[in-house]
Amino acid sequence: VRERGPQRVAAHITGTRGRSNTLSSPNSKNEKALGRKINSWESSRSGHSFLSNLHLRNGELVIQEKGFYYIYSQTYFRFQEEIKENTKNDKQMVQYIYKYTSYPDPILLMKSARNSCWSKDAEYGLYSIYQGGLFELKKDDRIFVSVTNEHLIDMDHEASFFGAFLVG
Amino acid sequence: VRERGPQRVAAHITGTRGRSNTLSSPNSKNEKALGRKINSWESSRSGHSFLSNLHLRNGELVIQEKGFYYIYSQTYFRFQEEIKENTKNDKQMVQYIYKYTSYPDPILLMKSARNSCWSKDAEYGLYSIYQGGLFELKKDDRIFVSVTNEHLIDMDHEASFFGAFLVG
Amino acid sequence: VRERGPQRVAAHITGTRGRSNTLSSPNSKNEKALGRKINSWESSRSGHSFLSNLHLRNGELVIQEKGFYYIYSQTYFRFQEEIKENTKNDKQMVQYIYKYTSYPDPILLMKSARNSCWSKDAEYGLYSIYQGGLFELKKDDRIFVSVTNEHLIDMDHEASFFGAFLVG
């Protein structure tokens, strides 16, 4: 069997709840990026998350080797009918995937959106958003995920995740 | 042109209807796995489904070579809404991707969910769920897809499918 | 660092608005393909879209090297709801991915669907559809995306895109 190990440039990082080392930094609401950056990713949960020739820093995957990467994320929005005055019944759930390069502002690579059910009879909502695409990245580029309505995200490791791998 | 063939470890298996060799086994409702396992996958429909250095057994893809795999599935839920005596039967449509290892219980890798429309005007629902992610798998690990509300799944080969490929 | 460049067979092409060189050709409504083919893809937007050992012709990615390809697309449907008397307001949003081979008719590889919200209270709809899968393609095969309700598609480059890469 051939040895593929050394060629591997890949990551799959997963949601985690309330871990003190992964709380949002004050800068998690980047004024130039839409939504709010997800910082609470876990990268070493056996059998579920890993980093291989990519680094994780402040919720961002940091590229070590230039090339074309398939980048993907899933975010699982979950909410219920709650008695709160002055709240619109509709929610826009948007997932953004950005990159930082040497250019100071983040660059939007992909966005995916859903709005919730408008019916007054709605009791709850379950909406997973997945997207992925191929992008050329350079050494030290950083990629991250941001979302609207971040308080609705279910950060179970099977439900919300972020990953990338080098293609070809 | 270089020869890539021998390096290929990949599969794309597709939904099939009522084929006797792919009907759910009595054990398709695994008590330790949420939902019901989909067994009715087809692996040799020309131009649509294939297995290359992966095996298919009882609806499960069986790993022949250890490594990081991008695993994905799409399931297409389709139904007529039935309003019975002013009761709305909201549907939670969840797709789970599990793996079996030497550990006796299946391990949940990914889950994606949608709920159906709450409006009383709803006549039918169309909901495709796609998810995918990177996971380290070992020889003889098995991966499978299970779903809630399996009777709602459209098992057309273009609509519901399951696949994996070795990365790097 | 090893040289991966020559091995790269990949593309990520992105939505574009009203560019004269990407307008639908008269044949974009292929009678044998469901939906309407999207022709307005951009392939050389720095940092966002590219072609590497694949060609783009009439909205179709043209294969240069046979092999197994992971093919994906995202289409972003966005619309205002219009309340018309006694008119059902439901929309079926379907994304199809087809291939052309030497066989004269296009062959459907994948389809993904959503219907819009039925509620009379609905004001607008946001629905991203992503799907992807692995398929064996031969030299000169062509792949394309078609959609129902194409006038609802948001062709921003981050929102709607189409891509493929050679696996293994």
Partner: antibody
Framework: EVQLVESGGGLVQPGGSLRLSCAAS????????MSWVRQAPGKRLEWVAT????????YYPDNLKGRFTISRDNAKNSLYLQMNSLRAEDTAVYYC????????WGQGTLVTVSS | DIQLTQSPSFLSASVGDRVTITCRAS??????LSWLQQKPGKTIKRLIY???TLDSGVPSRFSGSRSGSEYTLTISSLQPEDFATYYC?????????FGGGTKVEIK
């Protein structure tokens, strides 16, 4: 502040009927689903009925369907439970709760079915 | 119907103890589970919703968690006012179902 106040409980003979009311305040009543829950003496909580926010849907457990009817009057911010063909086993404290996930509860009203 | 199996049904503990109550769901409920506190003569109070979200005004010693189909209410350091009966409730589907309750008493 959300407030739910039940009324209408009391002593009733087996086979009789009773109508419970729940007066709601502190939120836009018509936007939210409402439920009735009961608790027999020394027993666990038991769900009785729910009506959706828009009033389109009503839900009951199978064992109460046909005997109990939930309704609402959004103009009066009121929820009702009509209970017919009452039995001794319907004896319980009846609570109204809002919304369908039962964030808020009333103090309850006692229904005693006895001859 | 979805069954909620709550355990233990009775718990004797001292002030300052860490207390754990579990609730197992027989089917997927997507985290739509809440924990309620009932004290004699008082209005029933919701403590936790969506499996792990603390209601406003509820002390931080209460927490909820989920592992698959098992849901847990934890009181990190039991206080005198916490002696009560606790119920889990699933609101993912109809019929709504409650756990059997856990009575927490002073040792």
């Amino acid at each position: 502040e959300v407030q739910l106040v039940e009324s209408g409980g009391g002593l009733v003979q087996p086979g009789g009927s009773l109508r419970l009311s729940c007066a709601a305040s502190g939120f836009t009543f018509s936007n939210y689903g409402m439920s009735w829950v009961r608790q027999a003496p020394g027993k666990r909580l038991e769900w009785v009925a729910t009506i959706s926010g828009g009033g389109s849907y009503t839900y009951y457990p199978d064992n109460l369907k046909g005997r109990f009817t939930i309704s609402r009057d959004n103009a009066k911010n009121s929820l009702y439970l009509q209970m017919n063909s009452l039995r001794a086993e319907d004896t319980a404290v009846y609570y109204c709760a809002a919304p369908t996930a039962m964030d808020y509860w009333g103090q309850g009203t006692l229904v005693t079915v006895s001859s | 119907d979805i069954q909620l199996t709550q355990s233990p049904s009775f718990l004797s503990a001292s002030v300052g103890d860490r207390v754990t109550i579990t609730c197992r769901a027989s089917q997927e409920i997507s985290g739509f589970l809440s924990w309620l506190q009932q004290k004699p003569g008082k209005t029933i109070k919701r403590l936790i919703y969506a499996a792990s979200t603390l209601d406003s005004g509820v002390p931080s010693r209460f927490s909820g968690s989920r592992s698959g189909s098992e849901y847990t209410l934890t009181i990190s350091s039991l206080q005198p006012e916490d002696f009560a009966t606790y119920y889990c409730l699933q609101y993912a589907s109809y019929p709504r179902t409650f756990g059997g309750g856990t009575k927490v008493e002073i040792k």
